[in-house]
Interface confidence: low
């Protein structure tokens, strides 16, 4: 067990041309904080994959305002370490993920904002107990400088925190096999404790509560011989006549990965893979928790109370990602009512309203009638951002001015004469329809496919549209 | 209460390497940076490099050609050896005593040796 | 990283009050340290992080930082106090001393 330390010296723009901006103003001020995510080995994990070494995160850094169109200078930072407990084995390798991430203190609805500045990426090798490693990485126009390494909590001792140091029970020299524990003087190197239970004469480690099998032998406790030919039925009983070895339980039997891990056999043992939030040979052991608070962007973490539970986050609308850290197209929701057009500024949604509406959304409609009129008798209609008119029969237009031609849209179908007429417009109809506007056929036989005529009215009369 | 002393030869000829040691007294070995430091004489200070329990040193690119700086914990002691050293390697050697992550924080200095390079 | 020291020497008197400024080369955040050397003697630690007062150093020292601008004062000078002061920046490799600044008796 142990800790990796981190200290970010600086973040600001790095050398030669193009300087970002300052990602603070006085109508925006800001503050930084950072998160590290650490993953055992030289991977090329995605960023979104587990952080199986454990995460921290920053305390913010002191708020901070640059004037308008300056140049960014190095920006304050917070105070203290980043730590990331391990309780495993330090790795020796390993890879980091370090964002750098602003707070917006702006007027915003819904407080705060958050976004990604930079994200910083390497693989290094180190040693626990060694110096602090400088490092400096560049993300686009920035730069970040820090500082790192690795320690064992007493009393894990080593390269790897694998060696355990007791303090010496008497000033004689240490017991039989058993090394001083350099470089503390006064204790000695503890025996190695493997996992309770472990076969002594089958199994071995090396590291505490491990237990690793022998050649030939296999189980949780190496107590189970492997077969040494091949039987008809792997987990059928012994047969004096074939000479089997039987095997017993395999190794995954009862399903020894906790937190729903599943397993699956090696040669030697079996191999647990692991869920999201969880690492160790039994997958017992949760790097990030609740407490940690790997939820970005206001999303709620749920669960992972306590290390051995994973974490789940529930982000905000807007936000996505199993740590809300990714921000998705908030004009994809189409907030912007009326026709408006939707602006995603990156701490805030704007929405640019039509002519005639007004609000965050677009969603108050202005009175598009005050102090108009329509002439002739028109009425007006609000929406649409522009007043209308609803014009009396025999008017058009914008404002009603207009007398209509009624007949202009050819409104009688089937060959039927259009005639104008003051309170409306009248289809004559060709032989063989009939209707308003001539819709209908009439039926050879002098039915219609309509109720009888109206009094008063022939087929083939010239009926008036009302 | 931390000690340190420090010994080695005072008098070299050009061309050959100097050597010092730095004993530790009182106090923990590890998670500490052990320093040496330089000094001509009426010039200021200059860091020559540092090493930790474990063996893992820093030096100074002016110099990290020629020095090597090495520990023994059983002995709670670490040495600075410079070859091929010139007169302009004439100067106070101090071994030092620095903490891990605290900013400038070389509380604990040796006496000083001074080394006099001349044929 | 280059430590630029101010003035390289200065004549005060007791109870002066007194101020020796480093200026980094670049931006070395609080990574800095006061050092006091008296002739034929070991340098002695006074502030360490530019503004903490190192145990058992008295309180009319102090450090202060502006940016990368970094000043040692001493509110009272004490005949004791006459001496070289240096800083030292532990930001980045090769850690760097400022040239010093001798302090004599005017």
């Known amino acids: 067990a142990g800790v990796f330390e981190l200290q970010i010296h600086s973040f600001g723009p790095g050398p030669g041309p193009g300087a970002p901006r300052s990602p603070c103003s006085a109508r925006l001020p800001c503050r930084l904080f950072f998160r590290v995510c650490l993953k055992p080995g030289l991977s090329e994990e995605a960023a979104e994959s587990p952080c199986a070494l454990g995460a921290a995160l920053s305390a913010r850094g002191p708020v901070y305002t640059e004037q308008p169109g300056a140049p960014a200078p190095d920006l304050p930072l917070p105070d203290g370490l980043l730590q990331v407990p391990f309780r495993d084995a330090w790795p020796g390798t390993f890879s980091f993920i370090i964002e750098t991430w602003r707070e917006e203190l702006g007027d915003q609805i819904g407080g705060p904002a958050w976004s990604l500045l930079a994200r910083v990426a390497g693989r290094r090798r180190l040693a626990a107990g060694g110096p602090w490693a400088r490092d400096i990485q560049r993300a686009g126009a920035w730069e970040l400088r820090f500082s790192y390494r690795a320690r064992c909590e007493p009393p894990a001792v080593g390269t790897a925190c694998t060696r355990l140091c007791r303090p010496r029970s008497a000033p004689s020299r240490c017991g039989p096999g058993l090394r001083p524990c350099a470089p503390l003087e006064d204790e000695c190197e503890a025996p190695l404790v493997c996992r309770a239970g472990c076969s002594p004469e089958h199994g071995f480690c090396e590291q505490p509560g491990e237990c690793r099998c022998l050649e030939g032998w296999t189980g949780p406790l190496c107590t189970v011989p492997v077969s040494t030919s091949s039987c008809l039925s792997p987990r059928g009983p012994s047969s004096a006549t074939t000479g089997c070895l039987v095997p017993g339980p395999g190794p995954c039997d009862g399903n020894p990965c906790a937190n729903g891990g599943s397993c699956s056999e090696t040669p030697r043992s079996f191999e647990c893979t692991c869920p999201r939030g969880f690492y160790g040979l039994r997958c017992e052991v949760s790097g990030v928790t609740c407490a940690d608070g790997p939820c970005f962007n206001g999303g709620l973490c749920v669960g992972g109370a306590d290390p051995d539970s994973a974490y789940i986050c529930h982000c905000p609308p807007g936000f996505q990602g199993s740590n809300c850290e990714k921000r998705v197209d908030r004009c994809s929701l189409q907030p912007c009512r009326n026709g408006g057009l939707c602006l995603d500024l990156g701490h805030a949604l704007r929405c640019r309203c039509r002519a005639g509406f007004a609000g965050p959304r677009c969603e108050h409609d202005l009175d598009d009638c005050a102090g108009r009129a329509c002439a002739n008798g028109g009425t007006c209609v609000e929406g649409g951002g522009a007043h209308r008119c609803s014009c009396a029969l025999g008017f058009g237009g914008r404002d009603c001015r207009e007398r209509a031609d009624p007949c202009a849209a050819r409104p009688c179908a089937h060959g039927g004469r259009c005639y104008a007429h003051f309170s409306g417009l009248v289809c004559a109809c060709a032989p063989g329809y009939m209707g308003a506007r001539c819709e209908f056929p009439v039926h050879p036989d002098g039915a219609s496919a309509l109720p009888a005529a109206p009094p008063g009215l022939r087929p083939g009369d010239p009926q008036r549209y009302l | 209460q931390v000690q340190l002393q420090q010994w080695g030869a005072g008098l070299l000829k050009p061309s050959e390497t100097l050597s010092l040691t730095c004993a530790v007294y009182?106090?923990?070995?590890?998670?500490?940076?052990w320093s040496w430091i330089r000094q001509p004489p009426g010039k200021g200070l200059e860091w020559i490099g540092e090493i930790i329990h474990s063996g893992s040193s820093n030096y100074n690119p002016s110099l990290k050609s020629r020095v090597s700086i090495s520990v023994d914990t059983s002995k709670n002691q670490f040495s600075l050896k410079l070859s091929s050293v010139t007169a302009a390697d004439t100067a106070v050697y101090y071994c030092s005593r620095g903490e891990y992550g605290s900013g400038s924080r070389f509380d604990y200095w040796g006496q000083g040796t001074l080394v006099t390079v001349s044929s | 990283i280059q430590m630029t020291q101010s003035p390289s020497s200065l004549s005060a008197s007791v109870g002066d009050r007194v101020a020796i400024t480093c200026r980094a080369s670049?931006?070395?955040?609080?990574?800095l340290g006061w050092y006091q050397q008296k002739p034929g003697k070991a340098p002695k630690l006074l502030i360490y992080a530019a503004s903490s007062l190192q145990s058992g150093v008295p309180s009319r020292f102090s450090g202060s930082r502006s940016d990368t601008d970094f000043t040692l004062t001493i509110s009272s000078l004490q005949p004791e106090d006459f001496a070289t002061y240096y800083c030292l920046q532990d930001y980045d490799y090769p850690l760097t001393f400022g040239g010093g600044t001798k302090v004599e008796i005017k």
């Open positions: 670049q931006g070395i955040r609080d990574d």
């Open positions: 009182g106090g923990s070995f590890s998670g500490y940076y």
